[in-house]
């Protein structure tokens, strides 16, 4: 449940150095600068816990500022092998090698890592993100071509004493940024190694890792200003759940965004939105601080617990759900996007659900902490919250069984 | 500035098909849908159907879904439509327009004319 | 299919006049109505949104109301180039439809 046991050397206090080692904003993804290679080339990465590569963009591209030149790094090694991994919609391919990798607002170690080095790719890089590559921070089960490719974090834990342990503190804006703004903004903060104390309030609550390939996890019950949606759980995790700092939304299941909208629909029916908010085409606009966030509901999700028949709920605000956008043509006004989306591949807990939030990846006790994170953006009314615990039972029949195939690893 | 840039007038023969592409600049690409609609000569607007840049999810007017195709590129910010099947009553102006609060931004459009 | 039913199809007017347009969709669409001016060989350009919302830059003499099923745009004083093909749209559900469009003409 809570996290009070005693304190661990190296997993506790203050990590001052990489506070605020994030940028970015949600739409975009959040990137920390990495150096890779001897000479370093400094490069942003995005930071994604819903694939398992460490891969950079190796060459020229319309969309990239500067990228990775191996033949620059006296400590580049081929290993003469590609990967080529294909997404929903796009793909990206490249040549396998490893190179010395740091972070120089992380551990200061230094480490030999896999690196993918992007020759070729679609609809991957975005124009304007400002990130170059991607540091994919899930597990080797997911990673490509295959297993035998030991993931960045993995090949960190191994060569250094670094505990196998990150947590993440995604700061939503609240308002829309411009690319300056994004530039000079502060994102947010991944913790490697441990858990900061200034990044969150509260308790911290746990649950399980189910299956250690993405992050996976169960839901076990869903609410909508407290009504709860009474759905069979499992289809909460139809066919799997996980947490992904690589999406933008909070992504559901077919039913389950069905019936989540419906009852979002009817709490906000005070005004009458468009279809095209709800599927996330148009935009919904008030005039310049007049945003009714009373109108709209609190979402809870309930997570397993790590005791039996006990549960946590996390709730997010309107706030995390209504992404900002800017559009010039309604400039006066503040403008946002449904941030909820309809998914075919399971619940993915997306940048909406973690910006509310601390998330801590304790790979060492296979479970993910959640606290209300001190950087969230609330009204004077209503908060995010973690709370528990909740009795909830019979949440093992919650989890989806996945026929076995091969599963491709996405950021959407 | 946000502009939305179509290619140039089509002549096409009935049965034909044709693909009129629209070049978008000045704001995130992915952040924004794009329409296209349509105009005959001297008549309304007809809206065609739309496209998410970020996924390529579609959605079409029933009119048109079984001979529309909205495609996108992001590597190059172009959205395309293509109309097959094409017979003397599509002769028409067609735009693409980007989404946000209704149609905030149109292309200049784009004549196609089937004519035997 | 919601129609969205524009009157008059054109009208004259002078320079000066005060202008409106009504439209009136065939079921109730909220607030989710727009407007566009079209001048001949050119693509619409936005006016307002949201049934009163002016899009940036767009002239204050432009207004627009209602809600449910009625409503109207106002040209306060018209002025020689707001002489155009006018167009309301809903855009509460799919397929987006737009009224026939009214002609202003100079008297």
């Known amino acids: 449940e809570t996290d009070e046991e005693p304190e661990e050397p190296g997993r506790r206090g203050s990590f001052v150095e990489m506070v605020d080692n994030l940028r970015g904003k949600s739409g975009q993804g959040y990137y920390v600068e990495m150096t890779v290679g001897s000479p370093p080339q400094t490069l942003n990465i995005l930071v994604d816990t819903g694939s398992s590569n460490f891969a950079v963009g190796a060459a020229p591209h319309p969309f990239l500022h500067r990228y990775y030149q191996r033949q620059l790094s006296s400590t580049y090694r081929d290993l003469r092998k590609g990967v080529y991994v294909p997404y929903t919609q796009g793909k990206w391919e490249g040549e396998l090698g490893t190179d010395l990798v740091s972070i120089p607002h992380g551990p200061n170690v230094t480490v030999r890592a896999n690196i993918a080095a992007i020759t070729e790719s679609d609809k991957f890089f975005i124009n304007g993100s400002n990130w170059e590559g991607i540091l994919g921070l899930a597990y080797a089960e997911i990673a490509r071509p295959d297993d035998s490719l030991e993931p960045f974090f993995d090949s960190l834990v191994k060569q250094t004493h670094v505990p196998n342990l990150f947590s993440l503190q995604l700061c939503g804006a609240g308002f829309p940024l411009n690319q300056s703004e994004v530039l000079a903004s502060v994102g947010g903060s991944m913790i490697i190694g441990g858990i900061d104390h200034s990044l969150y309030t509260g308790s911290l609550w746990y649950t399980p890792i189910r299956r250690e390939w993405y992050y996976e996890v169960i839901i076990v019950r869903v609410e909508i200003n407290g009504q709860d949606l009474k759905m069979d759980c499992k289809e909460y995790n139809y066919d799997k759940s996980i947490v992904d700092s690589g999406t933008t939304n909070l992504r559901l299941p077919k039913k389950v965004f069905e019936a989540a909208v419906k009852s979002i629909k009817a709490a906000s029916s005070t005004e009458k939105f468009p279809d095209g908010f709800w599927l996330g085409e148009q935009l919904v606009c008030w005039q310049a601080g007049t945003t009714p966030w009373n109108i709209f509901p609190v979402i809870s999700l309930y997570l397993m617990g790590e005791v039996t028949n006990q549960s946590f709920r996390i709730t997010i605000l309107p706030q995390q759900y209504l992404r900002p956008v800017e559009d010039v043509a309604t400039s006066q006004d503040d403008c946002y996007k449904f941030a909820i989306s309809q998914s075919s591949t399971g619940t993915v807990m997306g940048a909406v659900i973690m910006e509310g939030f601390y998330v801590v990846f304790d790979r060492a006790r296979k479970r993910i902490g959640f606290a209300v994170s001190a950087c969230h953006v609330h009204d004077e009314f209503r908060t995010a919250a973690v709370e528990g615990p909740f009795v909830t039972l019979d949440m093992e029949d919650c989890g989806y069984n996945i026929p076995q195939t091969d599963e491709s690893t996405l950021m959407t | 500035q946000v502009q939305l840039v179509q290619s140039g007038a089509e002549v096409k023969k009935p049965g034909a098909s044709v693909k009129v592409s629209c070049k978008a600049s000045?704001?995130?690409?992915?952040?924004?849908?794009i329409h296209w609609v349509r105009q005959a000569p001297g008549q309304g607007l007809e809206w065609m159907g739309i496209i998410d840049p970020s996924d390529s999810y579609t959605k079409y007017n029933q009119k048109f879904k079984a001979r529309a195709t909205l495609t996108v590129d992001t590597s190059t910010s172009t959205v395309y439509m293509e109309l097959s099947s094409l017979r003397s009553e599509d002769t028409a102006v067609y735009y693409c327009?980007?989404?946000?609060?209704?149609?905030?931004?149109w292309g200049q459009g784009t004549l196609v004319t089937v004519s035997s | 299919d919601i129609q969205m039913t524009q009157s008059p199809s054109s009208l004259s007017a002078s320079v000066g006049d005060r202008v409106t347009i009504t439209c009136k969709a065939s079921q109730d669409v909220g607030r989710n109505v727009a407007w566009y001016q079209q001048k001949p060989g050119k693509s619409p350009k936005s006016l307002i949104y949201?049934?009163?919302h002016r899009y940036s830059g767009v002239p204050s003499r432009f207004s627009g109301s209602g809600s449910g099923t009625d409503f109207t745009l106002t040209i306060s004083s018209l002025q020689p180039e707001d002489f155009a093909t006018y167009f309301c749209?809903?855009?509460?559900?799919?397929?987006?439809?737009f009224g026939q469009g009214t002609k202003v003409e100079i008297k």
């Open positions: 000045g704001y995130t690409f992915t952040n924004f849908w």
């Open positions: 327009a980007r989404s946000g609060v209704a149609f905030p931004y």
């Open positions: 949201s049934a009163s």
């Open positions: 749209q809903q855009y509460n559900s799919y397929p987006y439809t």
